[in-house]
């Protein structure tokens, strides 16, 4: 039986009931390499409680479909004698980048998990040449996820005091030229996450081939390496890597870009302070307020729910949005598709699309950025989820009684980009974490 | 205050049945993840089984299919269902809860002998 989503075949994942104290090792391809698991298990859970494993999902028990993978095992999940067995199920969603899997459930017989990726995707549209895995968990289980810093277009120019080259970089995946035929990266080559611009020449110094490491709390590391043998002409002989570290700051504080730190014969350094290396926790909620010590923030977006059926409008040319967050009101527009975010074309108001869901919310604030993300709408052509994502922007004098408005700024492969000034969105600091 | 106390040990014959029970005051108990362990003389502490907040049940190898663990969250109770009883179950048992928002809850162990 082949492989169903062989992108993703290349490694084990991790995925964390963080409830329970338990960590799922997962590989969807072969088996995971853990003695206590036995040979055959493809998915592997380690209770850090009782330092015990437990196969629940077996490589030879498998079975597939476009979006489904199931591992079952021959382990009988009660005691009654019942014929049912411990299982493992993996719902697979598109994404626009490889993602990670997220554990959703556990019942006394199946595990549940949820993977967006573009494994699952219906088109090649987001595909990478190259992509490894960009999260990672820290030793108290913890989550750190650098997948929203990936660019499927464009690259990060690297802070450097080189007036003759520039480096570019991507993260966790090779540069998509493609996508942005206007740049100085259109030389780079195919496949290159390091992309170093001399004049009108560009050399790959580095391809993605491991997934993210943690080093030690706070601080994660991505390794880049060029893969062919062909040595560069400037690098002394040596072949060209590029090592990436993405620091936590020790408080809050807006972005940074990444920095060099040490070169020398086409080994290249790079420091990158930002928020999205501390864990996710920090950075994410699942409501519209992000509070307490552990986020050293204080927001709350919840006045700007709607109450009465009423919406925010949006207007965005051949559409009109209609907007209710941070709650579970209907949208008239958009009966019982349960939708913060809906989308109806204006020459044809029959044409209504969900453009995110109000149980798929996250509210993140990260270097700085405020932003309210709706996603699980209505699946594009590519096999997408239609998703939205607000910006919100602190402004003390926002009409409205100081809520303000929402504004479409555009949408890109069925994302919804909008920009919302807000006296709500001011946000409150606290002492560092 | 968070507590948990166990009930239902004693002396069993080998083949014997027991029922302990672990009822919690102080916690949200459906929120919690329930372990059983014991400790029998002059050893350490071991795992028995585990019951996830979600459902979940795992045994140690030992009492795999003898033991049953289950929790009625009504009653805020978990209970393990020991049948088959050996000489070697002889220990104290604990119980255990944990959540991520608690430090992790023993209680005070019930004994129980399998002698004939």
């Known amino acids: 039986q082949a492989a169903p989503f062989p992108e993703l075949c290349s490694y084990t994942w991790e995925a964390v009931d963080t409830k329970n104290n338990v960590l799922y090792k997962i590989n969807i391809c072969g088996s995971v390499d853990i003695v206590q698991c036995g040979p055959s298990s493809a998915v592997c859970m380690h209770d850090l409680k009782t330092r015990t494993y437990h196969s629940v999902g077996d490589s030879v028990l498998r079975s597939a479909t476009r979006s489904l993978l199931e591992f079952n095992t021959t382990v009988s999940c009660d005691q009654q004698g019942t014929n049912h067995r411990v299982q493992s199920s993996i719902a697979f969603l598109c994404g626009k980048t490889l993602g990670t899997p997220e554990f959703v459930t556990a019942t006394e017989c199946v595990h549940y998990f949820e993977w967006r990726t573009t494994a699952a995707c219906k088109k090649d549209i987001f595909k990478a040449n190259k992509e490894v895995p960009c999260y990672v968990f820290d030793e108290e289980l913890r989550k750190h996820d650098l997948n929203p810093l990936i660019k499927l277009s464009g690259a990060y120019l690297v802070d450097d005091s080189d007036p003759d080259t520039s480096l570019f970089i991507n993260v966790c995946r090779d540069i998509d030229t493609l996508r942005d035929p206007g740049s100085q990266l259109r030389a780079c080559p195919p496949g290159t996450a390091a992309c170093l611009v001399r004049g009108h020449q560009a050399f790959d110094v580095g391809q993605p081939r491991d997934g993210l490491k943690v080093v030690r709390k706070d601080r994660l590391v991505l390794s880049y390496v060029r893969e062919e043998a062909g040595k560069l002409d400037f690098c002394d002989g040596h072949s060209p890597a590029v090592t990436i570290t993405f620091v936590c700051p020790s408080e809050r504080r807006e972005g940074t870009i990444p920095k060099l730190t040490a070169k020398s014969n086409c080994r290249y350094e790079i420091e990158w302070i930002t928020e999205y290396a501390c864990h996710r926790d920090y950075l994410e909620s699942k409501t519209c307020s992000l509070s307490g010590e552990q986020q050293d923030v204080s927001i709350d977006l919840t006045p700007l729910a709607q109450s009465g059926g009423s919406s925010y409008i949006s207007d965005g040319k051949e559409y009109l949005f209609y907007l209710n967050v941070c709650g579970e009101t209907e949208i008239q527009f958009c009966n019982k598709k349960q939708a913060a975010v809906c989308q109806v074309k204006k020459s044809d108001t029959s044409q209504v699309k969900a453009a995110g869901r109000y149980h798929n919310q996250t509210l993140r604030y990260s270097d700085g950025d405020l932003t309210l993300i709706y996603f699980g709408g209505d699946e594009c052509s590519s096999g997408f989820q239609r998703m939205s994502v607000i910006n919100f922007e602190c402004n003390k004098t926002a009409g409205n009684d100081g809520k303000g408005t929402p504004v479409f700024t555009g949408e890109v492969d069925c994302t919804y980009e909008f920009t919302w000034d807000t006296e709500y969105a001011c946000v409150h600091h606290h002492h560092h974490h | 205050q968070v507590q948990l106390q166990e009930s239902g040990g004693g002396l069993v014959q080998p083949g014997g049945s027991l029922r302990l029970s672990c009822a919690a005051s102080?916690?949200?108990?459906?929120?919690?993840?329930m372990d059983w362990y014991r400790q029998a003389p002059g050893k350490q502490r071991e795992w028995v089984a585990t019951?996830?907040?979600?459902?979940?049940?795992t045994y140690a190898d030992s009492v795999k299919g003898r033991f049953t663990i289950s929790r009625d969250n009504t009653k805020n109770t978990v209970y393990l269902r020991m049948n088959s009883l050996k000489p070697e179950d002889t220990a104290v048992y604990y119980c255990?809860?944990?959540?991520?928002?608690?430090?992790?809850?023993w209680g005070q162990g019930t004994q129980v002998t399998v002698s004939s």
């Open positions: 255990k809860a944990s959540s991520p928002v608690l430090n992790d809850i």
């Open positions: 102080g916690i949200i108990f459906s929120d919690n993840r």
């Open positions: 019951l996830a907040s979600y459902g979940w049940k």
